[in-house]
């Protein structure tokens, strides 16, 4: 029972984590304008991995995609790569772990096969989580470096008569989503690996010993012992999961010039 629970929980936690990694990767708020120096700006800038946006007080938001590949910083490319690798590994891991779930019966799949699949998916989740955490951390480090560089420029270039407000960027919501999601995927992966140990049958088959005494032949053939899971080998615990989680992408409609009531 404990193994099934651990495996199921690991799957759910990983699923939430991967959903979070996908969400973080798609989010535009990886870096947001630091308002400390100019808290009353009428124009708010924020940037994602794929595009940069400007939100005006008017309610209009303009986003521009990074349509170049060669012109982008290597670090940004690296972050993109890490996040995508994390998503791909996580998605494959989810696919593998679905078939590995103890509560799902597929043909005559043996527990040893399920154990191997659970371990594989667990490792995939761990690597996926680490990729996401690494990607977010690299981006955060990039922000910190740029933040202090622009702060230095701000205070060294104040000799002129005309003030130029330097736009500094700080951590956006996507970073925190990414860190949490990566952590969840990692935890889910560890749980899957733990569950794998409980699923693997510990084969302790003793060689059959025959005793020939006074014409009677007795053969002892003890069966292999299975690690106790709380369920007999013939007992199958079937559960039906109703996928009730529906995600709706709320498309925020921005005003048009003539928005009639």
């Amino acid at each position: 029972m404990a193994v099934t629970a651990c495996q199921g929980l690991g799957f759910v936690v990983s699923l939430i984590g991967i959903a979070g990694i996908i969400a973080a990767t798609c989010m535009d708020q990886w870096s947001t304008q630091d308002l400390y120096n100019n808290p009353v700006t009428a124009v708010f800038n924020y940037q994602g991995l794929w595009r940069s946006c400007v939100r005006e007080s008017s309610g209009f938001t303009e986003c521009r995609g990074y349509f170049t590949l060669l012109g982008l910083p290597a670090m940004l490319q690296a972050v993109r790569a890490l996040m995508i690798v994390g998503i791909v590994l996580g998605a494959i891991g989810l696919l593998v772990s679905i078939f590995a779930l103890k509560c799902i019966r597929i043909g005559s799949m043996e527990d040893s096969a399920k154990a191997n699949m659970t371990l594989t998916s667990g490792i995939m989740f761990i690597v996926s989580g680490l990729c996401a955490i690494a990607g977010v951390s690299v981006f955060a480090n990039m922000l910190v470096t740029n933040f202090w560089m622009s702060t230095a420029n701000m205070y060294t270039g104040m000799g002129g008569m005309v003030q130029t407000v330097q736009t500094r960027y700080t951590f956006g919501a996507a970073l925190f989503v990414g860190w949490v999601a990566g952590g969840l995927t990692l935890i889910g992966g560890v749980m899957m690996c733990i569950a794998c140990r409980g699923l693997a049958p510990e084969e302790t088959n003793y060689k059959a010993v025959s005793y020939h005494a006074s014409g009677h032949s007795v053969a002892y053939k003890p069966g292999g012992f299975k690690a106790s899971t709380g369920f007999g080998s013939n007992t199958k615990n079937k559960k039906t999961y109703d996928g009730g989680a529906h995600t709706e992408d709320e498309l925020q409609s921005y005003p048009s010039k003539h928005d009639y009531v």
Epitope: A42, V43, E56, S57, G59
Partner: antibody, heavy 118, light 113 residues
């Protein structure tokens, strides 16, 4: 057709209060940032206050901060400016305007006159 | 606060003449996020509310004649009327739309000779 109609302007004594209204038609008020701008007797334009789309943030000029309050009633499609502790320097023509691209005001009302005098 | 300085305060012109008026800000109005200047030009005729002419320093509002041109970047901006018409006689205001308070210039009054 987009229309903004201000009302509520009056002659008021110093220290008094007044509530200006700006009835909007032809667009959904909640989806746009809105501003109040006043024009003093010497014809200078002075920005008074802004409420951004969604109505989360409000901004005020230093001269009215703490005395004026901008709000909106989305159900009535109306913008308000609650003015209190009025001073003689608040005497002006008050305009409400809709914010467009670049935070520019693309539509203005005809204005409502506020006179603060004893 | 960003201070907006308009010059000249008044201009006397003849119909058909090319007119240029200036607007300077104490701080840059250029937003690095979209490389746009948050400066707006308004026209106000007597007894009327101001009318939007130019936003983002150089983008003409729909319905505004193409004789009106906005230019400039950072702190120096210009409104040019290529051939002044009688209906252009008004006061022209520039406004900072980048940072609160959204300050206006004192205006440039366009008059006929």
């Amino acid at each position: 057709e987009v229309q903004l109609v201000e009302s509520g302007g009056d002659l008021v004594q110093p220290g008094g209060s007044l509530k200006l209204s700006c009835a909007a038609s032809g667009f959904t008020l909640s989806r746009y940032g809105m501003s109040w701008v006043r024009q003093t007797p010497d014809k200078r334009l002075e920005w008074v206050s802004t409420i951004i789309s969604g109505g989360i943030n409000t901004y005020y000029s230093d001269s009215v901060k703490g005395r004026f309050s901008i709000s909106r009633d989305n159900a009535r499609n109306t913008l308000y400016l609650q003015m209190s502790s009025l001073k003689s320097e608040d005497t002006a023509m008050y305009y409400c305007g809709r914010l467009y691209y670049g935070n520019a005001m693309d539509y203005w009302g005809q204005g409502t006159a506020v006179t603060v005098s004893s | 606060d960003i201070v907006m300085t308009q010059s000249p305060s008044s201009l006397t012109v003849t119909a058909g003449e090319k007119v240029t008026m200036s607007c300077k800000s104490s701080q840059s109005l250029l937003n690095s996020g979209n490389q746009k200047n948050y400066l707006t030009w308004y026209q106000q005729k007597p007894g009327q509310p101001p009318k939007l002419l130019i936003y983002w320093a150089s983008t003409r509002e729909s319905g505004v004649p193409d004789r009106f041109t906005g230019s400039g970047s950072g702190t120096h901006f210009t409104l040019t009327i290529s051939s002044v018409q009688a209906e252009d006689l008004a006061v022209y205001y520039c406004q900072n739309d980048y940072s609160y308070p959204l300050t206006f210039g004192a205006g440039t009054k366009l008059e006929l000779k």
